[in-house]
Interface confidence: low
């Protein structure tokens, strides 16, 4: 969490941002809140990005003002206009690109004063893994697949019964580049699976951590997946 204040005493307002991550090709949110104002027409929101000449987005007098918007963001940004009056300056970024990563500044002007806070935005690709029994294999084998990751993640297998066991010798992980030549499909196979056990396939990079669980018994297979972003720190 980053909390920023304006520069001059009583003319400062608190602005709060939360570091976040964007999944390339999807829409992302850059979070920013501020002390609300009574009049929408008195609120100015400017989003800036370090190293970029133009603005990322500007909202003033109750509407978007995009004439100074940098070309790399054109057509891809929006604020939640109906929530600005309650202090929400968060920015929706459409079709997140790898190059959108960087330091952003949320700069706010209201009738109470000015304030700003920085936000670190990471971009990459992350997706939920799915773990299945691989019936094509000669022995009981688990297959963990996740369609889109970037940068290349690590994959670790764990088991409820054999806690702390190292499965690297009995697993094989491969990364297959997707058609857009950035993200990769992750496939990991675990051999020598025993029944009446729960296995976890954990995929992690510096942006996200995802886990796919599978419970294997003779009579049934139960699956569960979970995805967690790693850098959601408030500022």
């Amino acid at each position: 969490l980053i909390i920023g204040f304006g520069i001059s005493g009583r003319h400062s307002i608190t602005v709060t941002t939360v570091a976040s991550a964007g999944n390339i090709g999807e829409d992302g949110i850059l979070s920013c809140t501020f002390e609300p104002d009574i009049k929408l027409s008195d609120i100015v929101i400017q989003w800036l990005k370090e190293g970029v000449l133009g603005l990322v987005h500007e909202f003033k007098e109750g509407k978007d003002e995009l004439s100074e918007q940098d070309e790399m963001f054109r057509g891809r940004t929006a604020v939640f206009a109906d929530q600005v009056i309650v202090g929400n300056a968060s920015l929706r970024l459409k079709n997140v690109q790898l190059t959108d990563a960087g330091t952003y500044k949320c700069y706010i002007i209201t009738s109470k004063g000015k304030g700003n806070a920085n936000l670190e935005y990471k971009t990459g690709a992350f997706s939920m893994p799915e773990v299945n029994v691989d019936y094509n294999a000669s022995s009981e084998t688990l297959r963990c697949e996740a369609p889109r990751w970037f940068p290349q993640p690590t994959v670790v297998w764990a088991s409820q019964v054999d806690q702390g066991a190292n499965f690297s010798e009995v697993s094989n992980t491969s990364f297959e580049l997707n058609s857009e030549n950035v993200t990769m499909k992750v496939v990991s196979v675990l051999y020598n699976v025993t029944i009446n056990n729960t296995y976890s396939c954990m995929i992690e990079n510096d942006i996200a951590k995802a886990t796919g669980d599978i419970k294997v018994t003779e009579s049934e297979i139960k699956r569960r997946s979970h995805l967690q972003l790693l850098n959601s720190k408030a500022s």
Epitope: L53, E58, E65, S67, E68, Q69, R74, R76
Partner: antibody, heavy 120, light 108 residues
Framework: EVKLVESGGGLVQPGGSVRLSCATS????????MSWVRQPPGKALELLGF??????????EYSASVKGRFTMSRDNSQSVLYLQMNTLRAEDSATYYC???????????WGQGTTLTVSS | QIVLSQSPAILSASPGEKVTMTCRAS?????MHWYQQKPGSSPKPWIY???NLASGVPTRFSGSGSGTSYSLTISRVEAEDAATYYC???????????FGGGTKLEIK
């Protein structure tokens, strides 16, 4: 060095069609919005339309005066911008420029222009 | 769609004089760009984002303005400044670039 070079102008009969080209070099073509601007003899500049960059899906916008008659396209592998003009009229006679949109919504590089005359 | 009106259409000045040309928008805009065009040549970016001089533009040129009124000023006109100057802005709704009608600067 950024270069934009238009070609394809000349004399065309009313009702005819022509395709103008703008060959570019010196920059990553797919990263930029590209526009066509025309200027009739002795008159002001008029924007015909623009085609967005890769990040924005290469979508197009046209001015009302040419919508439906003119079509912009781009070959990103060859870094070439095109303007297909159909059902030409005498008032389409002009110098046609291609221009690159900078990162600040203005045109930082222009071609030398190609002259089109529509006359019988 | 925003309309840009430039005045005067023709401006005549002697070398050393200070001249100002204006560009008025039909509704408020937050920035204006200017181009210089000489006969037989393509337009050159001259001033961008209201007041920033493009590369190679002499410092005797300046730009200012806000809202619906913008101006280009030459502190001391020189013979090489004879040209037509066009203002231009970007509108996001609908998305389109718009040019003014131009101001032709003549040197006496």
């Amino acid at each position: 060095e950024v270069k934009l070079v238009e070609s394809g102008g000349g004399l065309v009969q009313p009702g005819g069609s022509v395709r103008l080209s703008c060959a570019t070099s010196g920059f990553t073509f797919s990263d930029y919005y590209m526009s066509w601007v025309r200027q009739p003899p002795g008159k002001a500049l008029e924007l015909l339309g623009f085609i967005r960059n890769k990040a924005n899906g290469y979508t197009r916008e046209y001015s009302a005066s040419v919508k439906g008659r003119f079509t912009m396209s781009r070959d990103n592998s060859q870094s070439v911008l095109y303007l297909q003009m159909n059902t030409l009229r005498a008032e389409d006679s002009a110098t046609y420029y291609c221009a690159r949109d900078s990162h600040r919504t203005y045109f930082d590089y222009w071609g030398q222009g190609t002259t089109l005359t529509v006359s019988s | 769609q925003i309309v840009l009106s430039q005045s005067p259409a023709i401006l005549s000045a002697s070398p050393g004089e200070k001249v100002t040309m204006t560009c008025r928008a039909s509704s408020s805009v937050s920035s204006m760009h200017w181009y210089q065009q000489k006969p037989g040549s393509s337009p050159k970016p001259w001033i961008y984002a209201t007041s920033n001089l493009a590369s190679g533009v002499p410092t005797r040129f300046s730009g200012s303005g806000s809202g619906t009124s913008y101006s280009l000023t030459i502190s001391r006109v020189e013979a090489e400044d004879a040209a037509t100057y066009y203002c231009q802005q970007w509108s996001s709704n609908p998305p389109m670039y718009t040019f003014g009608g131009g101001t032709k600067l003549e040197i006496k």
